[in-house]
């Protein structure tokens, strides 16, 4: 028997520095977690103690903090190289800055293979990107070889900016021939490493013949055997065992997100490459694990540029950006309109001739807006200004909801109107009319939404049974501010880009902004 230790991360999302327990900015260092310096300490400890170790990443290193905004992926290549990762799969967020934003900072700089079997380049890009990412890689580990085959969510064109010269194929269809190739190369220990979410990970384990282990990402799934060490609730045991169609027991793992845990899986193979046993657990990277001093020093050196960036002008406003609680928690405010417009703009994807865009709607809890921006400061808008408006470090996510769920959400928006509570919704691509003289739960008298399957966008009445795509803060997707109906009834949830980054990119693109209050939210006569 031969034993392999798989260390794995996924959905790190730019958390190079240690974070608080909820993966936001570290406030109390003695209680902080994760970060590449602490990760390196643990990885090195395991490498010293065990003979056959692979360090793998299942995608979405890109996007999530000011580190990515400033360094645009160079930080990912640098610190993953420093940690000596053995392989990485491409996630959807790796395409957030387009293909060029993947090729230059990461693909050309990484000293480890970057993988995806179901992304096929065509046209002029094919020769440019050739060899920079691979469908699979055979890695020598001790006296043996291990095949790693990569995959990426086929939804990436809707979630990021891969352009028109990359085709995202069905994962299972694309993986099978690559695994077959590995078998013909006499590689009998094969790991599928990828970024399509836990449901697809399980399908791959079930359907792709020859895959021994699946290491996944995208769904931020936390698996654990025994008593979990922090606040994440396990979605199942670690590893999660799937019985394949050909009768094998295939371990499937994921390690939550944000570099909070290091996945730790021990696999025992027989001489024919069959998995005899698998066990392990994610390791919580808490403050009991010291940060490696040399990596920490490097982090501090790279940090300097971030502090300078915060005060640089991103663009200008020629109007007052009203982010006051008096406005945003009671009525339409132009700061809410600006943020929603940025959220929609960030999700422009012309993927189908029938649709001008795949999503037209945005909702945003007014309580999430925490500062105005005064135009009388020469109109200057900085990252620092935006960090005061959006101080909680969330993301703007894509969900799919039924019209009936949206109706409930808008009723919730005004169910206790007038108390300066945070659930009052700011909107984009939506026209809502409330009648506050009616009883709570029956106050939405008109709800029109912007069509997507149209060449000239116009507002149509919301249909209760139709499924709509909506951009919203992750806080709302998770049921925050009492929006339990969103959490309970959402049909799909894909995590998006860092909130401040979305707005800063929009302002930089527009150069000069002048959002208005324009009748997106109205109160019917006699009630307000």
């Amino acid at each position: 028997a031969w034993e392999l230790t798989i260390l794995h991360t996924n959905d790190v999302h730019s958390r190079l520095e240690q974070t608080s327990e909820d993966s936001s900015k570290c406030v109390n260092a003695s209680r902080c977690m994760g970060g590449v310096a602490r990760l390196f300490t643990k990885v090195q400890q395991i490498r010293r103690a065990e003979p056959n170790v692979l360090l793998l990443d299942a995608g979405d290193q890109y996007q999530g903090t000011i580190w990515f905004t400033v360094y645009k992926g160079a930080e990912v290549a640098h610190f993953m190289n420093a940690l000596r990762y053995d392989a990485m799969a491409l996630g959807n967020h790796e395409f957030d800055n387009g293909v060029e934003g993947l090729i230059e900072p990461l693909l050309k700089e990484a000293k480890f293979p970057i993988l995806s079997a179901n992304i096929k380049a065509k046209g002029p890009l094919a020769s440019q990107i050739s060899g920079l990412y691979l469908p699979y890689k055979v890695l020598p580990v001790g006296d043996e070889v291990v095949g790693i085959v990569g995959y990426t969510s086929k939804e990436t064109p809707f979630l990021s900016n891969p352009g028109t010269n990359l085709v995202f194929e069905d994962e299972i269809t694309a993986l099978q021939p690559e695994v077959d190739k590995l078998k013909t190369l006499n590689v009998n220990k094969i790991i599928a490493l990828g970024h399509s979410g836990f449901e697809m990970d399980k399908l791959i384990a079930q359907k792709v013949r020859g895959v021994d282990v699946v290491v996944g990402g995208h769904s931020n799934t936390f698996l654990y055997t025994g008593n979990p060490p922090s606040k994440e609730v396990p979605a199942g045991k670690y590893p999660f065992i799937v019985t394949s169609d050909d009768g094998r027991k295939v371990p499937v793992v994921q390690a939550y997100a944000f570099g909070k845990y290091l996945g730790y899986l021990k696999i025992e193979f027989d001489e024919r490459g069959n998995v005899i046993s698998s066990h392990g657990n994610p390791i919580l990277l808490n403050s009991s694990i010291p940060e490696d001093p040399s990596i920490k020093a490097d982090i501090n050196k790279w940090r300097i540029k971030l502090d300078n960036y915060s005060t640089q002008e991103l663009g200008k406003t020629i109007v007052y950006l009203d982010g006051s609680s008096q406005s945003c928690r009671f009525r339409e405010c132009n700061m809410g309109n600006l943020i929603c417009d940025a959220m929609i703009n960030n999700n422009l994807r012309h993927t189908d001739e029938m649709f001008w865009n795949h999503v037209s709607m945005c909702i945003l809890n007014g309580g999430g807006i925490r500062s105005p921006i005064d135009e009388r400061n020469n109109g200057t808008i900085t990252w620092e200004n935006l960090a005061a408006v959006l101080p909680f470090g969330g993301t703007f996510d894509l969900v799919q909801l039924k019209g009936s769920t949206l109706k409930k959400a808008f009723e919730h928006s005004v169910h206790r109107y007038g108390q300066s509570t945070g659930e009052f919704l700011q909107v984009g691509g939506i026209h809502v009319v409330y009648d506050l003289s009616r009883k709570p739960g029956d106050r939405v008298v008109k709800l029109d939404v912007l069509c997507t399957k149209c060449r000239v966008p116009s507002y149509d009445p919301l249909k209760m049974d139709e499924v709509y795509k909506v951009i919203l803060p992750n806080f709302l997707a998770n049921g925050g501010d009492g929006f339990q109906m969103i959490k309970d009834e959402l049909l799909r949830h894909d995590s998006g880009d860092q909130d401040i980054n979305v707005v800063s990119t929009y302002i930089s693109k527009m150069k000069v902004i002048y959002p208005a209050v324009e009748g997106r939210i109205k109160f019917s006569t006699g009630s307000h």
Epitope: S325, A388, P391, Q484
Partner: antibody
């Protein structure tokens, strides 16, 4: 590290006034709604007042309405509670807190106000 | 104002016990309920918010449930450091605390 430090408590006669302060550090004070909560000796917790992050909304418990005024100075990272027409039943430890009952919930250690003749 | 009624007002239990404290609101408050722990001479500490969400750093033996008017705080296996006073608090309207439940060693 988040810190909230209350000050200004002490002994005051009935009908008198007192101004409590709460100095905040370790977080973006101007982004958070702030509360005052009190606890009479040997009794339970009683919410007193709240002020929104930008000062534009204030709400008070019925027991202090018209007598107490909450205010803040975001440039000084400080929350205040001006207490007038004090009564014996206002005797309590007064805590300042951020966004109670939410993720960003932090409390100070409290300052004792004693109203007695 | 919405009134919060906690029960029991005090209870005795031993280390390792499973303990349940209930809180009733005088009208529906959806899931706008929090649970606090307070030890003598100390500030209250948030355990649970939005009825069932565990606050960062709080051990998983604490859990909350309920919606509308009836809510429960459960400690699955009492530890020595859990002996304290527990308060529920609604934030549906201007905040209001329950009268507290004193948990003492049997």
């Amino acid at each position: 590290e988040v810190q909230l430090v209350e000050s200004g408590g002490g002994l005051v006669q009935p009908g008198g006034s007192l101004r409590l302060s709460c100095a905040a550090s370790g977080f973006t004070f101007s982004s958070y709604d702030m509360h005052w909560v009190r606890q009479a000796p040997g009794k339970g917790l009683e919410w007193v007042a709240v002020m929104s992050y930008d000062g534009s909304n204030k709400y008070y418990a019925d027991s202090v309405k018209g007598r107490f005024t909450i205010s803040r100075d975001n440039s000084k990272n400080t929350l205040y509670l001006q207490m007038n027409s004090l009564r014996a039943e206002d005797t309590a430890v007064y805590y300042c807190a951020t966004e109670i009952a939410a993720k960003g919930d932090y409390w100070g250690q409290g300052t004792l106000v004693t109203v007695s003749s | 104002a919405i009134q919060m009624t906690q029960s029991p007002s005090s209870l005795s239990a031993s280390v390792g016990d499973r303990v349940t404290i209930t809180c009733r609101a005088s009208q529906g408050i959806s899931n706008y309920l929090a649970w606090y722990q307070q030890k003598p001479g100390k500030a209250p500490k948030l355990l649970i918010y939005a009825a069932s969400t565990l606050q960062s750093g709080v051990p998983s033996r604490f859990s909350g449930s309920g919606s509308g008017t009836d809510f429960t705080l459960t400690i699955s296996s009492l530890q020595p450091e859990d002996f304290a006073t527990y308060y529920c608090q609604q934030s549906y309207s201007t905040p209001h605390f329950g009268q507290g439940t004193r948990l003492e060693i049997k």
